[in-house]
Interface confidence: low
């Protein structure tokens, strides 16, 4: 289920998956939400540790049974991921951080009268992830009103320093709130060139592009289809980048689909979920566990509701089954997709919806009918 | 609208014309108004130009050549896509707009009832097609709303009709075996209203079809008995109460 | 009615410039993927590149790659193609034509431009 | 990329006469396959889309047929209007021509 508590003064030990620094543990907690393999976090201010490479520290953790020992560290603060937690599931962070220097990447420096105007560029800006802004009392006259865009390999703060009159925050791009309008055309036959940030496997470029969405670095992708000339790279997904934001050139590429991350669109961002399921077809990964259930989509729901589970495949297959019911593949991997797709199976896959902000959530709603 | 007749004011109150300023200002779309706030219309519409901020829609007007400077209209708060739909498929050709502005309600200016969610029941044996879209394939836009009165086509027929798509159950087909009447481009998003028991319903939502008015080729519109769940989560206000007509 | 006007062609030595231009009226330019098509004097037709609708996406025949550049400007309902590196196999009639997109598919130019003469030569 | 023949190259007829050019592509284009009519020094014009379907405005004596690789137009009587050279088109991946057929007076 939801868990949306957090224990001040302790520390979550063991576990870890991942770390990186964040301005506060409410945004560390979404970094878990939306991280694969994270289940708990815990996170440090700067006020609860001396060691300055620590300081503003967010460690991402994973455990098989679900908790991690808990040790009382003062300031610390840890807590859940917000996977099930229906609509509070989101990657939109308003928040700015005054006093704190949120480091990065500078790639583009102006003088903007507001903090606020600052944020509204950086959303704006296709590659911005961040910034920093230096307030009209900063210490260096040279650098007042300066409004910093930044970006970082992981979306995240490459350090974070706290410094006097200086304020910090996020683009809010993940809150549809971008000036800069998104193409939503998929593009069949057609493979972009430049940088690749990641590769992960998807059955189909919809989920590609929803992967592209929520990656800090995906600005457009080209997906290799199951009947892609070379075996290896079917069902690839590349996630991609470019210096200027958009592909420098596309090429005719028989099954091949391109198209653009939709972080930048004006209305609401698609669901960080995947709720199609693919017919006779089977998504390979570390197995977390198998039951009999009856149906695809109990099987689904299944995954659903155990929280470590990424996705599944349902078999048909005669030795599979008992009576009505079959095996049901619950499944995980390093990077929440599958290590493996292979096709013309008996039996169905898809993935845990466990994301998905539509979900049932009674913690901070009471849901109304309508007259 | 092709082989259809000038309509009169205030006959179909809820047709609102979606109009793209750039340069010049265009009608691009037919709309319905469904709520004082919210207008349904086609995600294609949007196709190549989800800016909000270009868009002017026009409620309560009867000719598009009266349309003046000086004629107030509405603006888009959101553009609402129904999440499945794709430009390269037909499906799911299902947009809500949500206005700035509320509209208030006037004789020239109301909304449409919504049919019941999974409509399947009712026999709709009066049904019309309005719009300003080409009277012919290769025409113009027309001045004077245009109405249609097409009859429903079952669904198998309409699928043999189409071989090359899928007709789902979330479509609705409507034409003459001998073509003749139909939508046509520009009264795509516009609205495909039956009448039972005395009550107007929205039945569909011009979507799409093979040229216009063509013998055995019906034009194809998006149910809206099928999205009635989508409408409502979406016009949902946060007291619970829905922001838009639905049947008693 | 749809009109499709091609300007800027002429007589070019072999490594100059050149850039087309297709003024459009009569539907929505901003909609729809726009082409350019030549035809050599004699021979055949041959696609040369398109544009999507944003002009953020854009393709380009192998003969012409690298030295043909599209684009568009949808407020002027202008679609451009900027030649460089002229060769005297790019002397042709160069044709601007759009397709509609969307449901059915109707992906054939179904509607084209007069053209305008290329020459290459020294 | 997918290649489009067309056969034959030039096909002398008489008015009246029931003409048949062919076209074959390289792979399967499902029906995604246009025709084109040209005559000297215009600009080509549709006649035929989705492999058999009419063009509004175009003569009911011009038809289309096929799918996948093979396909055909037919003229069923010919006019003499119809003395052009006539293109096929595929649009299932990109854009290519067929080489052209010039239909002359025999």
């Known amino acids: 289920g939801c868990l949306t508590q957090l224990y001040e003064n302790a520390f979550f030990r063991g576990g870890d998956v991942a770390s990186m620094y964040t301005p506060n543990a409410q945004y560390c907690q979404m970094r878990c939400t939306f991280h694969p393999r994270c289940l708990l976090f815990s996170f440090l201010p700067a006020s609860s540790i001396n060691d300055m490479e620590k300081r503003f520290g967010c460690f991402l953790k994973d455990s098989v049974t679900g908790t991690l020992p808990k040790v009382h560290r003062t300031g610390a603060v840890s807590g859940h991921s917000l996977k099930q937690c229906g609509h509070q599931i989101s990657a939109c962070h308003r928040d700015i951080y005054k006093g704190v220097d949120m480091r990065g990447v500078n790639f583009n420096v102006s003088k903007v009268s507001s903090v606020e105007e600052c944020q509204k560029r950086c959303t704006s800006n296709i590659r911005c992830q961040f910034f920093s802004y230096a307030t009209q009392t900063f210490h260096k006259a040279e650098y007042r009103n300066n409004c910093l865009l930044k970006y970082s390999p992981g979306g995240t703060p490459t350090a974070i320093k706290v410094l006097s009159n200086v304020e910090s925050g996020f683009s809010l791009k993940p809150c549809a709130l971008s000036e800069i309008g998104c193409h939503m055309n998929i593009f069949q036959h057609l493979a972009f060139s430049d940088v690749d940030v990641a590769r992960v496997l998807t059955p189909d470029a919809f989920v590609c592009r929803t992967i592209c969405t929520y990656h800090p670095n995906c600005l457009f992708f080209t997906f290799y289809t199951n009947v892609w000339k070379i075996e290896s790279q079917r069902n690839v997904c590349l996630l991609k980048t470019s210096e200027s934001g958009t592909p420098s050139s596309s090429t005719p590429q028989e099954n091949t689909i391109s198209g653009y991350s939709l972080l930048t669109c004006k209305r609401t961002l698609p669901e960080p979920c995947h709720s199609k399921i693919y017919p006779g077809v089977d998504f390979g990964g570390e197995e977390l566990n198998v039951t009999f259930v009856k149906g695809v989509n109990v099987c689904q729901e299944t995954c659903t509701k155990m929280i470590r589970c990424q996705f599944f495949t349902y078999s048909l297959l005669p030795e599979d089954c008992k009576e009505e019911k079959c095996k049901c593949f619950l499944r995980l991997s390093m990077d929440g997709s599958p290590t493996r797709i292979a096709y013309g199976t008996q039996g169905s896959s898809g993935y845990s919806l466990r994301l998905c902000n539509t979900g049932d959530n009674s913690v901070c709603t009471t849901k109304t009918s309508t007259r | 609208i092709v082989g259809g007749t000038n309509s009169s004011w205030g006959e179909w109150p809820w047709q609102v014309s979606l109009q793209v300023k750039l340069t010049a200002q265009r009608h691009l779309c037919g709309g319905s108004l469904i709520g004082h706030q919210w207008v349904l219309t086609a995600a294609h519409c949007f196709d190549g130009l989800p800016l909000q901020d270009v868009w002017r829609i026009y409620s309560g007007i009867l000719n598009l050549s009266d349309i003046t400077k000086d004629t107030p209209f509405s603006q888009i708060k959101e553009i609402i896509i129904h999440q499945n739909y794709k430009v390269s498929e037909g499906n799911h050709d299902i947009a809500l707009i949500k206005l700035q502005a509320p509209l208030n309600y006037t004789e020239f200016q109301k909304p449409i009832c919504l049919p019941s969610k999974g409509d399947t029941s009712t026999i709709y044996t009066n049904c019309w097609v309005t719009g300003w879209g080409f009277s012919k394939e290769k025409g113009e836009i027309q001045n004077i709303l245009q109405k249609v009165n097409i009859p429903l086509v079952t669904n198998e027929e309409c699928q043999k009709r189409y071989q090359d798509y899928k007709i789902t159950q979330r479509m609705v087909c409507a034409g003459y075996k001998e073509g003749g009447k139909d939508a046509c481009k520009g009264d795509s998003g516009g609205p495909l209203v039956c009448k039972h028991n005395g009550m107007w319903r929205l039945v569909g939502i011009t979507s799409w079809g093979e040229g216009c008015a063509r013998r055995e080729q019906p034009g194809v519109y998006t149910k809206v008995a099928e999205y009635m769940d989508w409408i409502l989560e979406k016009t949902q206000s946060s007291d619970g109460k829905a922001q838009m007509q639905s049947p008693a | 009615e749809v009109q499709l006007l091609e300007s800027g062609g002429g007589l070019v030595q072999p490594g100059g410039s050149l850039r087309l231009s297709c003024a459009a009226s009569?539907?929505?330019?901003?909609?729809?993927?726009m082409m350019w098509v030549r035809q050599a004097p004699g021979k055949g037709l041959e696609w040369v590149s398109g544009?999507?609708?944003?002009?953020?996406?854009?393709v380009y025949a192998d003969s012409v790659k690298g030295r043909f550049t599209i684009s568009r400007d949808n407020s002027k309902n202008t679609l451009y193609l900027q030649m460089n590196s002229l060769r005297a196999e790019d002397t042709a009639v160069y044709y601007c034509?759009?397709?509609?997109?969307?449901?059915?598919?109707?992906?054939?130019?179904?509607?084209w431009g007069q053209g305008t003469m290329v020459t290459v030569s020294s | 990329d997918i290649q489009m023949t067309q056969s034959p190259s030039t096909l002398s007829a008489s008015v009246g006469d029931r003409v048949t050019i062919t076209c074959r592509a390289s792979?399967?284009?499902?029906?995604?396959l246009a025709w084109y009519q040209q005559k000297p020094g215009k600009a080509p014009n549709l006649l035929i889309y989705?492999?058999?379907t009419l063009e509004s405005g175009v003569p009911s004596r011009f038809s289309g047929s096929g799918s996948g690789t093979e396909f055909t137009l037919t003229i069923s009587s010919l006019q003499p209007d119809d003395f052009a050279t006539y293109y096929c088109?595929?649009?299932?991946?990109?854009?290519?021509f067929g080489q052209g057929t010039k239909v002359e007076i025999k």
């Open positions: 034509a759009y397709r509609r997109t969307g449901i059915p598919r109707r992906d054939a130019f179904d509607s």
């Open positions: 009569g539907f929505t330019f901003s909609h729809y993927i």
């Open positions: 544009i999507y609708s944003s002009g953020g996406i854009t």
């Open positions: 792979q399967s284009i499902s029906s995604w």
């Open positions: 989705k492999a058999s």
């Open positions: 088109q595929q649009y299932n991946t990109y854009w290519t």
